[in-house]
């Protein structure tokens, strides 16, 4: 490329006309401020191309950079673009006008910048000052560019004198932006909404002043755009939030909502997505199984838990035998329903120091205007077994009988065992089972009664012993799901002149025997 006159700097007179020519091996064009100028283009016979730019009636506003470049200059090397700077000294034009982009200079790091105050006359002396300040700052000036240096976050003006008048430039604002890596968080007021309700999502980025938010959402894909609102969040600068609000949601608004945040300075970006479900109407759904029969142990506390999903938030009621339950002032019952996630709930009924009377039919009902669900179960109060009586007798028939009576819930099992060697029993010798195929000749009769009022079973078992020829330790053991209890009696033969009986508690025995219940001999009777 060849420019005539060659420059690189020309000083032209105001009101004059001037012709510039650019030639090259391909079509060439004159540009100023990235705009093509009115010009005459030609092609010579020797296959050279030229463009003639005629500048007429020049004013100070024509001062600036002019470029000659190949017509399709994309990807061309810098030396395939020629620059010419023209000054048109004009006393009526002070500083050349700037657009807003030039007046506000944003930085992201400490770096050299240029305050672009330019004059039309290269002979003028230009000084830089803080806005409303008189002291000139020691910063180098280039008439074609302005003042270049490292500047603090302040506002600055340039001054010059044209003739006898002092002229000020516009103020230039230097401001350091806060930029950091981007970490986006997205949340929704609700991730489940009914049709007709609003969807409101928030996308938050912290620590950046230069961010662009872009939302992707189902409605956008169908060409229905929603204008997000950007605002500030919390009591902190640079917590910036973009809010996407979709009023009156439709079923088609279900899907993935993505917030993409970009920061153009360092080319950082991040995005987060959230799923929104629009339902036709509300719902309540039980999660997991709760058995139809539940258990609680007498005098212990028991919490019964039901897990369910619901939207919108439901009302939860508990009933016992069709009567509504509430938190009792005595603290015997506690009801609570808590939200463990947006649509998941746990409802708990806590019975404190369970009483027999609290057995019965329980129901939890969760409902709102669109749906309801209920769950019922029977609560059984388990009572640890107690041996209430162990007695020995000598009927006239000559046999000896031992009677054992006990209670508990659920129904207790009874185990009879005996030990001959009183000195070594039960620590050293295992007891032998009675009532079936033991070497003792014995018979067993067991009756079971259910007492409705106390809601427990009573077991009465009678052991008949045919031939007792030496003292025998007989033990009655009762067991159920929540415990065991035992008592012992010493049975002596008829022939002995004295009868010695001793009741021995479980603790005295100092060991646990592994015994098998002789259930096939039990006869159950319910009253």
């Amino acid at each position: 490329l060849v420019i005539t006159p060659p420059g690189p700097e020309l000083i032209l007179n105001v009101s004059s006309t001037f012709v510039l020519t650019c030639s090259g091996s391909a079509p060439v064009v004159w540009e100023r401020m990235s705009q093509e100028l009115p010009q005459e283009m030609a092609k010579a016979q020797d296959n050279t191309f030229s463009s003639v730019l005629t500048l007429t009636n020049l004013t100070g506003l024509d001062t600036g950079e002019y470029f000659c470049t190949y017509n399709d200059s994309r990807g061309l090397e810098p030396d395939e673009r020629k620059r010419l700077y023209i000054f048109v000294p004009d006393p009526t034009v002070g500083f050349l006008p700037n657009d807003a982009e030039e007046l506000f200079i944003f930085l992201t790091e400490i770096t050299e910048i240029t305050i672009p105050c330019r004059v039309t006359d290269p002979q003028l002396v230009v000084t830089l000052h803080e806005k409303k300040g008189d002291i000139a700052l020691p910063v180098p000036y280039d008439h074609q560019r302005g003042f270049s240096g490292i500047f603090e976050d302040r506002s600055y003006i340039c001054k010059t004198t044209i003739g006898d008048r002092e002229v000020d430039s516009d103020a230039y604002y230097v401001y350091r932006l806060q930029v950091s890596s981007i970490n986006v968080s997205v949340n929704a007021v609700q991730t489940v909404v009914r049709q007709g309700e609003n969807i409101t999502l928030m996308c938050i980025v912290i620590g950046n002043e230069v961010v662009n938010f872009e939302w992707m959402y189902p409605r956008k894909e169908s060409g229905r755009l929603v204008e997000p609102v950007t605002d500030f969040l919390l009591d902190m600068p640079y917590h910036i939030r973009s809010i996407l609000h979709i009023p009156s949601a439709e079923l088609e608004d279900s899907g993935t909502y993505t917030c993409n945040v970009t920061e153009s300075v360092n080319d950082h970006q991040d995005e987060k997505a959230i799923n929104i479900t629009v339902v036709e109407s509300g719902y309540v759904r039980l999660l997991g199984e709760v058995g139809a029969l539940q258990f609680a142990e007498l005098h212990r506390s028991r919490t019964l838990q039901v897990v369910f999903e619901a939207y919108p938030p439901p009302t939860v009621l508990w009933f016992k035998d069709n009567r509504t339950l509430g938190d009792s002032s005595a603290g015997e019952i506690a009801l609570s329903t808590r939200n463990v996630s947006e649509t998941r709930y746990v409802s708990e009924l806590t019975l404190v120091r369970v009483k027999v009377a609290e057995a019965g039919h329980y129901t939890m009902r969760a409902f709102h205007e669109d749906a309801e669900v209920q769950l019922s179960f029977q609560l059984q109060i388990n009572v640890p077994v107690r041996v209430l009586e162990l007695s020995e007798s000598h009927p006239d028939s000559g046999e000896q009988t031992v009677r054992c009576r006990g209670r508990g819930m659920p129904q207790p099992n009874i185990i009879w065992s005996a030990c001959r060697d009183l000195k070594r029993c039960p620590r050293e010798l295992p007891p032998m089972l009675l009532g079936n195929s033991s070497e003792e000749e014995s018979q067993l009769e067991t009756n079971v009664t259910y007492w409705e009022e106390e809601q427990e079973f009573e077991v009465v078992s009678t052991l008949r012993l045919q031939h007792v020829d030496r003292p025998l330790s007989v033990r009655c053991t009762l067991r159920n799901a929540v415990g065991q209890d035992m008592q012992e009696v010493i049975v002596v033969p008829h022939s002995l002149p004295f009868k010695e009986q001793k009741l021995i508690s479980e603790e005295d025995l100092g060991g646990e025997q592994k015994l098998i219940s002789e259930e096939d001999l039990h006869h159950h009777h319910h009253h």
Epitope: N98, A100, L103, S155, D170, V210, N212, T230, D231
Partner: antibody, heavy 127, light 107 residues
Amino acid sequence: EVQLVQSGGSLVQPGGSLRLSCTASGFTFSSYWMSWVRQAPGKGLEWVANIQQDESEKYYVDSVKGRFSISRDNAKKSLYLQMNSLRAEDTAVYFCARDLVPPRQGDYYHYFGMDVWGQGTLVTVSS
Amino acid sequence: AIRMTQSPSTLSASVGDRVTITCRASQSISDWLAWYQQKPGKAPNLLIYKASSLESGVPSRFSGSGSGTEFTLTISGLQPDDFATYYCQQYNSYSRTFGQGTKLEIK
């Protein structure tokens, strides 16, 4: 010298109209947002309206929406406020001001305040 | 609209005193807050922008602080020229709102 000179204030009847003018000098008017601010007698300042450099964005306080219109002529370095359907409560001294709103950096604007103000012009709405 | 509440409404002080005026926003405005001084019959004068940046030509005894919803203007070492009315002003989403003003008078 950077300055804003106002004109157009007067006494007007309720329901009447008035146009206020504000002429800039000493700075590149076309590079700045501009605002109108008013002050009722003995009261505080109330922002009324603002306008972007090329008139592509205009904003108003709720109480004047639909009645007032802000405009500008960059060639004449002038800002205007057309006031229609005036009410007694519009009585105030009206100020024009240069509003330092830089071009957008990302999705929101920065702000540096109103640094140059006109001398004010009194609008009295009374029958 | 964002509401700006200044306190106190009136403040009596003496030359040389250090005074503080508070401004609260009804919602977070980051640090987009300016402070102005106005004398009777005059246009307001910008003192502070961006909550804490001192406008050129304003004496260094004026300072601003705060972000989010709570802001303060402090004048350390009151001068006779400082007795005036002070206004805070927020900028957010294109609109502006002024506080109701604090009149600083001589005690």
